[in-house]
Interface confidence: low
């Protein structure tokens, strides 16, 4: 079952996906697609990386983190209700049926009417290197001592706006489990 995450219309949605490269720059191809992960590849590809770079994307979809270190989290700019649905992050590890597949459910809510716009935080800047992926070695050094390791088997994506004062609430709302 997919873990469910939320963003509001007009915000940027953030869908984390991580792996640990054998060495920095020794990358594994990754594809992102709209729809659940099929047997091979990604359906309705929105972004793809190869062994060197981002080599395909569609408008509004991009990687905000350091994908050279395995952060292949997807940012969707200025989301609309039509962006709701399942997204597949597929880490294309060489070999037969070795791919790591993560299905992430994005739910878009109508925008709240607020008197003034709230400042968005860049998750990768505010909370660097927090997540690790299943079966790819230990997490990197934690930068937030108050938070234990969050594993990608438990959380496949986080809400885009993780503000200091609402971190616990946002994690709870997203369905994440903190060990």
């Amino acid at each position: 079952s997919e873990v469910e995450y939320r963003a509001e219309v007009g915000q940027n949605a953030y869908l984390p996906c991580f792996y640990t490269p054998a060495a920095p720059g020794n990358l594994v191809p990754v594809c992102w697609g709209k729809g659940a992960c099929p047997v091979f590849e990604c359906g309705n590809v929105v972004l793809r990386t190869d062994e060197r770079d981002v080599n395909y994307w569609t408008s509004r979809y991009w990687l905000n983190g350091d994908f050279r270190k395995g952060d292949v989290s997807l940012t969707i700019e200025n989301v609309t209700l039509a962006d709701s649905g399942i997204y597949c992050c597929r880490i294309q590890i060489p070999g037969i049926m070795n791919d790591e597949k993560f299905n992430l459910k994005l739910v878009i809510k109508p925008a709240k009417v607020t008197p003034a716009p709230t400042r968005q935080r860049d998750f990768t800047a505010a909370f660097p290197r927090m997540l690790t992926t299943r079966g790819h070695g230990p997490a990197e050094t934690q930068t937030l001592g108050s938070l234990p390791d969050i594993n990608l088997t438990q959380i496949s994506t986080l809400a885009n706006e993780l503000r200091d004062s609402r971190l616990a609430n946002d994690l709870r709302d997203s369905g994440a489990t903190i060990r």
Epitope: G25, D50, R52, F67
Partner: antibody
Framework: QVQLVQSGAEVKKPGSSVKVSCKAS????????IYWVRQAPGQGLEWMGS????????NYAQKFQGRVTITADESTSTAYMELSSLRSEDTAVYYC???????WGQGTLVTVSS | QAVVTQEPSLTVSPGGTVTLTCASS?????????PNWFQQRPGQAPRALIY???NRHSWTPARFSGSLLGGKAALTLSGVQPEDEADYYC?????????FGGGTKLTVLG
């Protein structure tokens, strides 16, 4: 190792269109992104757009949106870049590139002159 | 569309060290912009040197290194050779488009 061979030089009239081809050999054409980059005489490089042949969908730089069409024919391992409504400032060498911009064609000079 | 700015020209002596930079009109350049660097000699197609900030291609000499410096992407040439005289371009990814810098003409004295 993929090699890219481009079509020959073209001379075009203002207002017309040009279609430049880029044929790949020696590798898996379909899964590589093909990029198109141009360089006006004495000027810098300008990224125009790209396509992954296996997907068929192209992305374009904002500047060229509506005037450029990038296509690919998997059966002949050839990518195409068509630029319409040509003007004199479109005079440039047009390059195709692949494999994350590591492999480049030899370039095609397009001259727009009345 | 974003504008990517490089030094128009730089001069260096053989054996010296020089750093070329690449700035974005949108703010600090991070690894998320996947900076690439290219060398272009007169009459030739560009040649890729560095990808994703600091990774050399197999054909790139070790004297070329990429980094992030003060909110810009940087290309440093150490122990410059006469054959390094060329134009150098950076290329940044903006989640919907790649944008080249204006290029730096590197002159090697002597």
């Amino acid at each position: 190792q993929v090699q890219l061979v481009q079509s020959g030089a073209e001379v075009k009239k203002p207002g017309s269109s040009v279609k430049v081809s880029c044929k790949a050999s020696g590798g898996t054409f379909s899964s590589y992104t093909i990029y198109w980059v141009r360089q006006a005489p004495g000027q810098g490089l300008e990224w125009m757009g790209s396509i992954i042949p296996i997907l068929g969908t192209a992305n374009y730089a904002q500047k060229f949106q509506g005037r450029v069409t990038i296509t690919a024919d998997e059966s002949t391992s050839t990518a195409y870049m068509e630029l319409s409504s040509l003007r004199s400032e479109d005079t440039a060498v047009y390059y195709c590139a692949s494999a994350s911009h590591t492999i480049w064609g030899q370039g095609t000079l397009v001259t727009v002159s009345s | 569309q974003a504008v990517v700015t490089q030094e128009p020209s730089l001069t260096v002596s053989p054996g010296g060290t020089v750093t070329l930079t690449c700035a974005s009109s949108t703010g600090a350049v991070t690894s998320g912009y996947t900076p690439n660097w290219f060398q272009q000699r007169p009459g030739q197609a560009p040649r890729a040197l560095i990808y994703t900030t600091n990774n050399r291609h197999s054909w790139t000499p070790a004297r070329f290194s990429g980094s992030l410096l003060g909110g810009k992407a940087a290309l440093t040439l150490s122990g410059v050779q006469p054959e390094d005289e060329a134009d150098y371009y950076c290329l940044l990814y903006y989640g919907g488009a790649w944008v080249f810098g204006g290029g730096t003409k590197l002159t090697v004295l002597g």
